[in-house]
């Protein structure tokens, strides 16, 4: 029985060239987190494994940093980074939980700076 829920930063925006933290939080379950995967539109960005720590996909090593926590930091943002991001929690005994974040990368200072998880 899957009782947990994933809280995410929801829809967020950031400026081109800047950085952003993608955060998900699994709550309302005592399930053990085995692994968290971060994906961008079906491309695996990074894995945080409970045993082995972080693995960043080679093609994203220059622009993706692990953390904070189980979150993911995207750096040197480009307009092409606009889109959906998913955190996938593999847990036991519950199974798989998925959270969605939509990131919009803006050309100028139109980006909202009030987002709690944003890096100035």
């Amino acid at each position: 029985m899957m009782t947990g829920t994933i809280e995410t930063t929801g829809n967020i925006s950031a400026e081109k060239g800047g950085s952003i933290i993608l955060q998900c939080h699994l709550s309302s379950t005592t399930a053990q987190v085995t692994q968290v995967n971060w994906e961008q539109q079906d491309q695996l960005l990074a894995i945080c494994n409970a045993d082995l720590g972080w693995h960043i996909s080679p093609s994203f090593k220059d622009r993706v940093a692990p953390g904070p926590g189980l979150g993911l930091t995207l750096q040197s943002l480009t307009v092409n980074d606009t889109g959906e991001y998913f955190c996938i929690y593999h847990t036991y005994p519950d199974g798989t939980y998925t959270g969605r974040i939509f990131l919009e990368v803006l050309e100028s200072s139109v980006a909202e700076h009030g987002a709690r998880f944003q890096i100035p």
Epitope: M2, Q32, T34, Q35, N37, D42, L44, I47, N49, A50, D51, L52, H55, H90, Y92, P93, D94, G95, T96, T98
Partner: antibody, heavy 119, light 107 residues
Framework: EVQLVESGGGLVQPGGSLRLSCAAS????????MSWVRQAPGKGLEWVST????????YYADSVKGRFTISRDNSKNTLYLQMNSLRAEDTAVYYC????????????WGQGTLVTVSS | DIQMTQSPSSLSASVGDRVTITCRAS??????LTWYQQKPGKAPKLLIY???KSHTGVPSRFSGSGSGTDFTLTISSLQPEDFATYYC?????????FGQGTKLEIK
């Protein structure tokens, strides 16, 4: 080339014990979640047990919980399944399998080893 | 436990045919559905994961689709080496359960 080679199967009496081994090569063994899956003669596939890369976390099907123990020795690139209190319904070909790094599917399987529980 | 039901259980087809196998989950499994191929006396082989992603080296004639509870595996043009048993497996929640299999035979 990824290779998984199981051994240790055989004929055992009900209530007996057996230890299966799976020798892995061709990949960084310690980085991957591993599982045992079984297939009774003429039947479908049944997930048995899973172990995390470092061996810290282990998961079992209800049908084997308390009787089977999965373990791994990363220095020897070997996965194990200790099977105790064996029953006739445990008769099956046992496969070891490697998961994708993403943990989305089992991408490589061994050839299997047959365990027969009979008096 | 999540029950996985495949249909048909067996299927006769000819080389060159387009074949579709379906898999239904007893509850929502999102896209956490995998397809395996198994030949007699051999280990299963991964074909499709995450409902529609092809594993490395799998011929393009194999494709997967679906989400939620209903999934399909399609072989666009059957080849002689495709005659085998196909299994679906859910990865939404433990225990990870398999369908009963679909045996694809030569007509």
């Amino acid at each position: 080339e990824v290779q998984l080679v199981e051994s240790g199967g055989g004929l055992v009496q009900p209530g007996g014990s057996l230890r299966l081994s799976c020798a892995a090569s061709g990949f960084t063994f310690s980085s991957y979640i591993m599982s045992w899956v079984r297939q009774a003669p003429g039947k479908g596939l049944e997930w048995v047990s899973t172990i995390s890369g470092g061996g810290t976390n282990t998961y079992y099907a209800d049908s084997v919980k308390g009787r089977f123990t999965i373990s791994r020795d990363n220095s020897k690139n070997t996965l194990y399944l200790q099977m105790n209190s064996l029953r006739a319904e445990d008769t099956a070909v046992y496969y070891c399998a490697k998961w994708l790094l993403s943990y989305y599917a089992m991408d490589y399987w061994g050839q299997g080893t047959l365990v027969t529980v009979s008096s | 436990d999540i029950q996985m039901t495949q249909s048909p259980s067996s299927l006769s087809a000819s080389v060159g045919d387009r074949v579709t196998i379906t898999c239904r989950a007893s509850q929502n499994i999102n896209v956490w559905l995998t397809w395996y191929q198994q030949k007699p006396g051999k280990a299963p082989k991964l074909l499709i994961y995450k409902a529609s992603k092809s594993h490395t080296g799998v011929p393009s004639r194999f494709s997967g689709s679906g989400s939620g509870t209903d999934f399909t595996l399609t072989i666009s043009s059957l080849q002689p080496e495709d005659f085998a048993t196909y299994y679906c497996q859910q990865g939404q929640s433990y225990p990870y359960t398999f369908g009963q299999g679909t045996k694809l035979e030569i007509k």
